[in-house]
């Protein structure tokens, strides 16, 4: 209708990076920019994704290098993390959130794809990492190895081999395991501290240089107490599980101190593994009963999990696997290991800014049934799995509903702000829920809408529209872009209107009648008034139309509702040659060229397109006759 198709600004970017997957208009003290997501962008050798800032009138885009942002204290994997897959602007302070839903970190032998987002302030500076699903690894452990180095240990090389082999089993790195070694005999010394080395390679190298210090006495109690009071302090981390491994070949010369030492270790929650090396006893034919009892006393209960004995130093190699496995069985002590909570949550798959924080869709949470998490300045709210049971029953728990595929919110005059989330795979047909979140990790689900057709992906895109700008939502639009009709993936957008606290179905938006795939409803944007009639409008993307070139449809708002017939259909081919997937993302909240009219930003594969609004001239015709 009044969007200019003759002189668009087509901003080029990398197709392989999928520059244009997301677009947002951005205002910094009057300077207008486009923020463009490129979730497959490369940074160095890694395909991290990234975000670009693009000047609106002329000039080149600049990469923000958010892909280089690193989280300390985790062993992160940023390759394929899809930074820029979702963008959310905060109009209050012009900051925005760029999410990497496939950001993952190493935990033991697993990679947990918790997702993370970067908050960027209004002048494009990174300000904060938002990662509400990130939990400490179960391998967040400080392990201190307490080695008996007294004269009776022989040959020392076997102890060294054992040490090296057990260290190779440890997941050493930021956010995971730290290892320190103390050696004792008559005295105790730090061989190295917990925070001296950050990789298996470095720790193994250091361990290979530990020499036997000797000593005629075996002060095991002192060794344990030294480890507890000093080794765990120097480089120890708050909240890390404390594990001690004691390796000795004889009764201690300070066993009367063991009671107090062990009590203090218990108080400090130190889990103790104890290894009795019987070489000295066996070589001399001595009964080891008293020694074994002492080592069992040192080991945490139950003994069968924490106590080991070997015939001699050479046999230490035989317990490496068992010891390693027992330590790592600490990981999921009370956990059903086949079930995932937030470990694979992919938080940030969708994002939406609300007054007190940000909502993040986490499609992979709770075994891919999905969840919505909220991060606020006061902390995070992570609803429990059980909170969703009313609308996501236990019997469908293995279906992978993908709740959080999209998130938004509505405002009703009675309930205030209510959150909305889509679960496009729920029971194969899709579902949308409207809910409020509580600080006790529960939800109140007010309403649910269900899709009609299997595989239609109902709820993969949701937009709330305040048509008249009074602060109360009038219309909720739900996309089902895979809706199959007349032999093609045509797509459908469902219209729900707010009537006394409930959204009531009121038909669908009309698309064009082409006979190709379209995926109408892949993106739906509530945009500010385009046609200057004081009603806000809606733009719907159909990125597969015209043989994957793409198209957008503009629907006008009118008196608290939306007109279901498009006022303008803009195809990619009208604008420029070679555009593909035009309409995969849409944003229209700002006047970008200072003409007083709201302009549109539309994403495509490798391009961002700005469409300028033209003024609407209203001609009121009146006839009067003279003489009357």
């Amino acid at each position: 209708f009044n969007m200019d198709t003759r002189k668009p600004r087509v901003i080029p970017g990398s197709r392989t990076a999928f520059f244009g997957y997301t677009v947002q208009q951005h205002d910094i003290s009057g300077n207008k920019w486009l923020v463009v997501g490129a979730p497959l962008e490369t940074n160095g050798y890694q395909k991290t994704g990234d975000v670009y800032k693009c000047p609106v009138i002329h000039g080149n885009c600049t990469k923000l290098n958010l892909g280089r942002v690193t989280l300390s204290n985790v062993s992160e994997r940023k390759d394929n993390m899809r930074l820029g897959l979702s963008l959310a602007t905060n109009p209050k302070d012009n900051s925005f959130l760029a999410c990497s839903p496939l950001w993952s970190h190493e935990c033991g032998s697993s990679y947990y794809t918790t997702g993370m987002c970067s908050r960027v302030n209004s002048n494009f500076r990174f300000s904060k990492t938002v990662a509400p699903a990130l939990q400490r690894c179960q391998t967040y452990m400080d392990i201190v190895i307490v080695l008996d180095g007294s004269n009776s240990i022989y040959p020392w090389v076997e102890v060294q081999h054992f040490l090296i082999n057990i260290l190779k089993k440890f997941y050493i790195g930021p956010g995971q395991i730290q290892v320190g070694v103390v050696q004792y005999g008559e005295d105790v010394v730090h061989e190295f501290h917990l925070n001296d080395y950050r990789s298996v390679k470095d720790v193994v190298e250091a361990a290979s240089h530990i020499e036997q210090r000797g000593g005629t006495e075996t002060r095991t109690a002192f060794g344990i107490e030294f480890a507890r009071s000093e080794a765990f302090q120097k480089g120890g981390r708050k909240g890390a599980k404390k594990v001690m491994i004691v390796i000795t070949d004889g009764e201690s010369h300070d066993s009367p101190d063991l009671e107090k030492v062990i009590q203090q270790s218990e108080r400090d929650n130190v889990t103790r593994y104890a290894v009795a090396v019987l070489g000295y006893y066996n070589r001399r034919g001595i009964n080891p009963e008293t020694f074994l009892n002492e080592i069992k006393y040192i080991a945490s209960d139950p003994d069968d999990k924490h106590f080991f004995n070997v015939t001699d130093e050479a046999a230490l190699k035989d317990i490496v696997d068992a010891l390693g496995d027992r330590i790592f069985s600490l990981e999921g002590t009370n956990k059903n290991e086949t079930s995932f909570g937030l470990e694979m949550s992919q938080t940030g798959f969708s994002s939406h800014v609300v007054e007190d924080g940000v909502l993040l869709g986490a499609v992979g949470a709770y075994d891919w049934n999905g969840a919505v998490l909220k991060e606020t300045s006061a902390g995070k709210v992570i609803p429990l799995r059980e909170s969703y049971l009313k609308e996501f029953p236990e019997e469908l728990k293995n279906h992978g509903a993908y709740l959080g595929y999209t998130v938004t919110s509505v405002v009703s005059s009675r309930q205030g702000r209510v959150y909305v989330a889509g679960a496009p795979r729920f029971n194969h047909t899709g579902k949308v829920i409207l809910f409020t979140m509580h600080n006790n990790r529960s939800l109140t689900i007010h309403q649910a809408m269900r899709g009609q057709q299997i595989g239609s992906y109902f709820g993969s895109e949701i937009t709330s529209v305040d048509i008249d700008g009074d602060g109360v939502t009038d219309v909720l639009l739900v996309g089902a872009p895979m809706y199959f009709n007349e032999g093609r993936e045509r797509g459908k957008v469902y219209v729900y209107e707010l009537r006394q606290n409930l959204f009531v179905y009121n038909g669908t938006l009309k698309d064009s009648h082409s006979y190709q795939n379209a995926r109408f409803g892949s993106s739906i944007a509530s945009v500010r008034d385009l046609n200057q009639d004081s009603y806000n409008d809606v733009v719907v993307g159909a990125p597969l139309e015209d043989n994957h070139a793409g198209a957008i449809y503009i629907f006008h708002g009118f008196r608290g509702s939306i007109l279901k017939t498009p006022k303008q259909r803009i195809t990619a081919s009208e604008l420029a040659t070679g555009l593909q997937y035009f309409g995969c993302s849409i944003h229209g909240q700002l006047d970008l060229n200072e003409d007083g009219l709201i302009d549109l930003a539309v994403g495509a594969l490798g391009n961002a397109v700005i469409l300028w609004s033209r003024p609407v001239v209203q001609i009121n015709a009146s006839l009067h006759f003279e003489p009357s």
Epitope: H253, D254, P256, D257, E259, K260, E294, Y297
Partner: antibody, heavy 120, light 109 residues
Framework: EVQLVESGGGLVQPGGSLRLSCAAS????????IHWVRQAPGKGLEWVAS????????YYADSVKGRFTISADTSKNTAYLQMNSLRAEDTAVYYC?????????????WGQGTLVTVSS | DIQMTQSPSSLSASVGDRVTITCRAS??????VAWYQQKPGKAPKLLIY???SLYSGVPSRFSGSRSGTDFTLTISSLQPEDFATYYC???????????FGQGTKVEIK
């Protein structure tokens, strides 16, 4: 030759204090434990307190807890028993004895004893 | 706390007699039980450690044994210098808390 010599005993009024010393020679206090054991006139042996000179861990009999303090000065190779708030029932001969690994945690050497009399 | 109950509290015997003194622990204990001999006006002397090991310099007529929670000191052939008071002593495992028995006075018959 291993030797333990107690000193510091004497007559003291109820509520008073006394400090007993146990000077060790012929071995290093650092690698052993010292126990104080007492024997009231005509009675059996009663364990009083112990200290690990190395770790400074201490143990006390319930009857003296809070009143007696055991300590050691490894540089002087001497152990001490500080006795406060003394009562008539604390009257006894006080022995110090060595306790260590090599005698399988038995008291292998004893001092000659020092008499403490608590009386008004 | 572990109690050591020593019996008898006294006994009369003649030179050459076999004498047996018993200590019963109130609960299961380690073998860290020792026996001491004390003569009037003198400090106690160690005879037996670890329930059955003879301390150096102690005559072989002294022996110790264990049966469950019962510990026994045996003098195979009583000698004139053996008339004294005998004490058992138990060490609490992994602490330096110790307990003595009440003592057994061996007198000349």
């Amino acid at each position: 030759e291993v030797q333990l010599v107690e000193s510091g005993g004497g007559l003291v009024q109820p509520g008073g204090s006394l400090r007993l010393s146990c000077a060790a020679s012929g071995f290093n206090l650092y690698s052993s434990y010292i126990h104080w054991v007492r024997q009231a006139p005509g009675k059996g042996l009663e364990w009083v307190a112990s200290i690990s000179s190395y770790s400074s861990y201490t143990y006390y009999a319930d009857s003296v807890k809070g009143r007696f303090t055991i300590s050691a000065d490894t540089s002087k190779n001497t152990a001490y028993l500080q006795m406060n708030s003394l009562r008539a029932e604390d009257t006894a001969v006080y022995y110090c004895a060595r306790y260590w690994y090599h005698s399988a945690w038995a008291l292998d050497y004893w001092g000659q004893g020092t008499l403490v009399t608590v009386s008004s | 706390d572990i109690q050591m109950t020593q019996s008898p509290s006294s006994l009369s015997a003649s030179v050459g007699d076999r004498v047996t003194i018993t200590c019963r622990a109130s609960q299961s204990v380690s073998s860290a039980v020792a026996w001491y001999q004390q003569k009037p006006g003198k400090a106690p002397k160690l005879l037996i450690y670890s329930a059955s090991s003879l301390y150096s310099g102690v005559p072989s007529r002294f022996s110790g044994s264990r049966s469950g929670t019962d510990f026994t000191l045996t003098i195979s052939s009583l000698q004139p210098e053996d008339f004294a008071t005998y004490y058992c002593q138990q060490s609490a495992p992994y602490s330096s808390l110790i307990t003595f028995g009440q003592g057994t006075k061996v007198e000349i018959k």
